[in-house]
């Protein structure tokens, strides 16, 4: 039960995280005009990964896309790439994890296959989250650098008579959305990896051996003091699972790791 919960929660957390990464990537408020120490302006500027916008006090908003590809800063291109890679990995991870969910039955898929898929999706979520966090952090670092550079030469003009205020940009809402979303995706991925451990069968060289007393159809199991009717489905050689959570509908009683003879 705990494995299913961990896996399900990991999936939901990752889903929210990836939705957040997509939202952050699409948002226009990656950087917003810094109004601190500035005259009260009727025109507010903000920029995203794909376009820059101007909002006037009148309510009119005008956005212009970055139609050039080669003319854009390499850092911006890198951030775009990181975010897109994060989204793609996350989307694939979600697709894989849907089929890996223990609560969803697809044909006669082995638990070992589900465990592998859970691990794969978990790793994908971790990498996706790291990509998003890295992308947002690179952009934030770029903003901080530019902020202090523009502060250093904020006012330029002729003999101090005419002032040209250089627009300074600070962290926009998208950065915080991206950081949180990346973190959630990362946490979701870790949870999926933890759930995988609970699902994964432990391979062993030993097999569970049943001893049958004459005249009685009883299998003696020295470690667990458990008895079950012999020659049933549970007496066959099975892969030995560790003492993880079992779904309530599992009627078979698998040998525990202490049941070796």
């Amino acid at each position: 039960m705990a494995v299913t919960a961990c896996q399900g929660l990991g999936f939901v957390v990752s889903l929210i995280g990836i939705a957040g990464i997509i939202a952050a990537t699409c948002m226009d408020q990656w950087s917003t005009q810094d109004l601190y120490n500035n005259p009260v302006t009727a025109v507010f500027n903000y920029q995203g990964l794909w376009r820059s916008c101007v909002r006037e006090s009148s309510g009119f908003t005008e956005c212009r896309g970055y139609f050039t590809l080669l003319g854009l800063p390499a850092m911006l291109q890198a951030v775009r790439a990181l975010m897109i890679v994060g989204i793609v990995l996350g989307a694939i991870g979600l697709l894989v994890s849907i089929f890996a969910l223990k609560c969803i039955r697809i044909g006669s898929m082995e638990d070992s296959a589900k465990a592998n898929m859970t691990l794969t999706s978990g790793i994908m979520f971790i990498v996706s989250g790291l990509c998003a966090i890295a992308g947002v952090s690179v952009f934030a670092n770029m903003l901080v650098t530019n902020f202090w550079m523009s502060t250093a030469n904020m006012y330029t003009g002729m003999g101090g008579m005419v002032q040209t205020v250089q627009t300074r940009y600070t962290f926009g809402a998208a950065l915080f959305v991206g950081w949180v979303a990346g973190g959630l995706t990362l946490i979701g991925g870790v949870m999926m990896c933890i759930a995988c451990r609970g699902l994964a069968p432990e391979e062993t060289n030993y097999k569970a051996v049943s001893y049958h007393a004459s005249g009685h159809s009883v299998a003696y199991k020295p470690g667990g003091f458990k008895a079950s009717t012999g020659f049933g489905s549970n007496t066959k050689n099975k892969k030995i699972y560790d003492g993880g959570a079992r779904t309530e509908d599992e009627v078979q009683s698998y040998p525990s790791k202490h049941d070796y003879v």
């Epitope: 302006t41 009727a42 025109v43 916008c53 101007v54 009148s58 005419v162 205020v165 627009t167």
Partner: antibody, heavy 118, light 113 residues
Framework: QVQLVESGGGVVQPGRSLRLSCAAS????????VYWVRQAPGKGLEWVAV???????NYNSALMSRFTISKDNSKSTLYLQMNSLRAEDTAVYYC????????????WGQGTLVTVSS | DIVMTQSPDSLAVSLGERATINCKSS????????????LAWYQQKPGQPPKLLIY???TRESGVPDRFTGSGSGTDFTLTISSLQAEDVAVYYC?????????FGQGTKVEIK
């Protein structure tokens, strides 16, 4: 067509209050910002205040403590509440509509004269 | 507050001649986000309210004759009347539309010589 009609002007004693109104027609106050601009006799234009479509307001810092701009969207009317009036507040008060893009006043009323005198 | 300084204070031009009015702001009115200048020009005839001629420093308001041209960027702006007509006799004002309060220039009176 767009029309702005100011009213409420007149002669008032120093220290008293007065409320100017501006009736707007041909557009809605929920879609456009509206300004108050004043002009003292023989002088230039002085920007007083603005109320934006969303209800946000901005003031001339020199007048902010005494003047309050407001609007009633349902009545399509703009108001300017003027308190503690002084002789230097004597002027023609105009209301004007913001054009919506690049922030300029495209329609003006004929103005209402406020005279502050004892 | 942004200070708008117009020059000259008054201008006498012959009919059909060019009239040029300058406006200087104490701070740049060019917005880096959209590369637009937030400056407007108004014409006010005696006994009338002002009339919008130019917005965005260079965009002519609809219905305004094409002899009126706005130019300039940043802190220096110009209103040019290419061929002065009798009906152009008025006071012309420039206005900062970028920073609150939206200050006006002191005005330039245009007369016929």
């Amino acid at each position: 067509q767009v029309q702005l009609v100011e009213s409420g002007g007149g002669v008032v004693q120093p220290g008293r209050s007065l409320r100017l109104s501006c009736a707007a027609s041909g557009f809605t106050l929920t879609s456009y910002g509206v300004y108050w601009v004043r002009q003292a006799p023989g002088k230039g234009l002085e920007w007083v205040a603005v109320v934006w479509a969303g209800g946000n307001t901005n003031y001339n810092s020199a007048l902010m403590s005494r003047f309050t701009i407001s609007k009633d969207n349902s009545k399509s009317t703009l108001y300017l509440q003027m308190n503690s009036l002084r002789a230097e507040d004597t002027a023609v008060y105009y209301c004007a509509r913001d054009r919506g893009r690049l922030l300029a006043m495209d329609y003006w009323g004929q103005g209402t004269l406020v005279t502050v005198s004892s | 507050d942004i200070v708008m300084t117009q020059s000259p204070d008054s201008l006498a031009v012959s009919l059909g001649e060019r009239a040029t009015i300058n406006c200087k702001s104490s701070q740049s009115l060019l917005n880096s986000g959209n590369q637009k200048n937030y400056l407007a020009w108004y014409q006010q005839k005696p006994g009338q309210p002002p009339k919008l001629l130019i917005y965005g420093a260079s965009t002519r308001e609809s219905g305004v004759p094409d002899r009126f041209t706005g130019s300039g960027s940043g802190t220096d702006f110009t209103l040019t009347i290419s061929s002065l007509q009798a009906e152009d006799v008025a006071v012309y004002y420039c206005q900062n539309d970028h920073f609150f309060p939206f200050t006006f220039g002191q005005g330039t009176k245009v007369e016929i010589k």
